[in-house]
């Protein structure tokens, strides 16, 4: 947010940039929270635009019985590992095909015990205020599906008839991590010392971090003909004087006609 200055007063302005603003030779460059010629005004809305998507990661272990473990599988750049990764990924894509939040799998480690596959199942959903519920539901479906497939696709007479076979007892969910997004917390942090006066309101499921000086929201302060200005003690209405009226009151809703006042004074002289 920048305000340009022209003329002789500019040098003077340079030394007067407020609130951490810096002079660039032409104008005060204001930090995110401020604007105005001298960075003296506090913004009424802060962009806390949520991420487009929210991710979750499930740490799982399954035991693949249809492949015999070899030392080469420990080396992630080996032909063996690369092939295992391709087949395992293809198999998991089939298993989780009905889950819209499913993105893919990432093998972290292969170890002996038939082939014990430590891997992450990656989930992603479009941001909405209900993202936690959406991802919680998806993780439950992942658990159901992996439990089902590792129970059904098993070796019979030491031979697998499926793309991959598993040990039913080797399936474990170690950990589930969901990317945390807390708009209220972000809003408070970004508003710094004005944090008590900024709130999050939703419009079309998108969060907006606003002060009461931002018009058009349920918390908006109506200053009528005045101007809403944020200070450390909260939002205040700065009332205007027009050619005909003085305005006063907390919301500048009390107008006094100048002619009446002048007339009254005149009468006293």
């Amino acid at each position: 947010r920048t305000t340009t200055c022209f003329g002789d007063g500019c040098q003077n302005t340079a030394s007067r940039c407020k609130n951490g603003g810096t002079w660039d030779g032409l104008k005060c460059q204001c930090p995110n929270l401020y604007y105005g010629e001298l960075c003296e005004e506090v913004v009424s809305s802060i962009d806390i635009g949520p991420p487009e998507t929210i991710s979750a990661q499930m740490e799982l272990t399954v035991t693949v019985t249809s492949v015999k473990f070899t030392e080469e599988l420990k080396n992630h750049s080996s032909q063996e590992f690369q092939e295992f990764k391709q087949t395992f990924t293809e198999q998991m894509n089939i298993v989780y095909s009905g889950i819209p939040e499913y993105v893919g799998v990432n093998i972290t480690k292969l170890r002996l015990g038939s082939v014990v596959v430590e891997h992450d199942v990656l989930l992603r959903t479009k941001y909405t205020p209900e993202y936690k519920t959406v991802l919680d539901n998806a993780t439950e479906v992942v658990k159901e599906k992996i439990t089902k497939v590792t129970t059904q696709q098993i070796m019979i007479n030491d031979i697998c008839s499926d793309m991959m076979c598993f040990n039913t007892t080797g399936t474990q969910v170690q950990n589930i991590t969901v990317t945390q997004y807390d708009p209220e917390e972000d809003c408070r942090k970004m508003a710094k010392e004005y944090g008590d006066y900024f709130v999050v309101e939703y419009r079309d499921q998108k969060p907006y971090c606003i002060s009461p000086c931002e018009p058009g929201f349920s918390v908006s302060k109506n200053c009528n003909l005045g101007k809403c200005q944020m200070s450390l003690s909260g939002p205040q209405c700065l009332c205007v004087t027009t050619e005909t009226h003085w305005y006063s009151g907390e919301t500048c809703n009390q107008g006094t006609q100048k002619s009446l006042v002048y007339g009254h004074h005149h009468h006293h002289h």
Epitope: S66, K68, I159, C160, M164, C165
Partner: nanobody, 124 residues
């Protein structure tokens, strides 16, 4: 990348024999799996036999047990299928398949590398 080239197909009378070969190249290890699959017209591809090149395992489909023998020559990197006592129902395109893993699955989807196939016709 792994390349597989089959040869040895042809027309043979019932009760006769044939030997199929499959030359493999592109492996970084000398321990891997190789298999023979076949596909008859209008039918799904099915396993005939597989072998681990370290000699650790061989497998035969019930329909060919005692008649077919799978083997592998490590020095030549070549897979063989000796087919004896051939029957009309053995008529199919025979495919060589390979994996750098020691596989124990007969599902063709688990086998990533394939030859172009060689036709075997058993007919009088």
């Amino acid at each position: 990348d792994v390349q597989l080239v089959e040869s040895g197909g042809g027309v043979v009378q019932p009760g006769g024999s044939l030997r199929l070969s499959c030359a493999a190249s592109g492996y970084t290890s000398n321990r891997y799996s190789m298999a023979w699959f076949r596909q008859a017209p209008g039918k799904e591809r099915e396993v005939v036999a597989f072998i681990w090149t370290d000699g650790g395992r061989t497998y035969y489909a019930d329909s060919v047990k005692g008649r077919f023998t799978i083997s592998h020559d490590n020095a030549k990197n070549t897979l063989y299928l000796q087919m004896n006592s051939l029957r009309a129902e053995d008529t199919a395109v025979y495919y060589c398949a390979a994996s750098s893993l020691l596989l124990q699955t007969i599902n063709p989807r688990a086998w990533p590398y394939w030859g172009q196939g060689t036709m075997v016709t058993v007919s009088s």
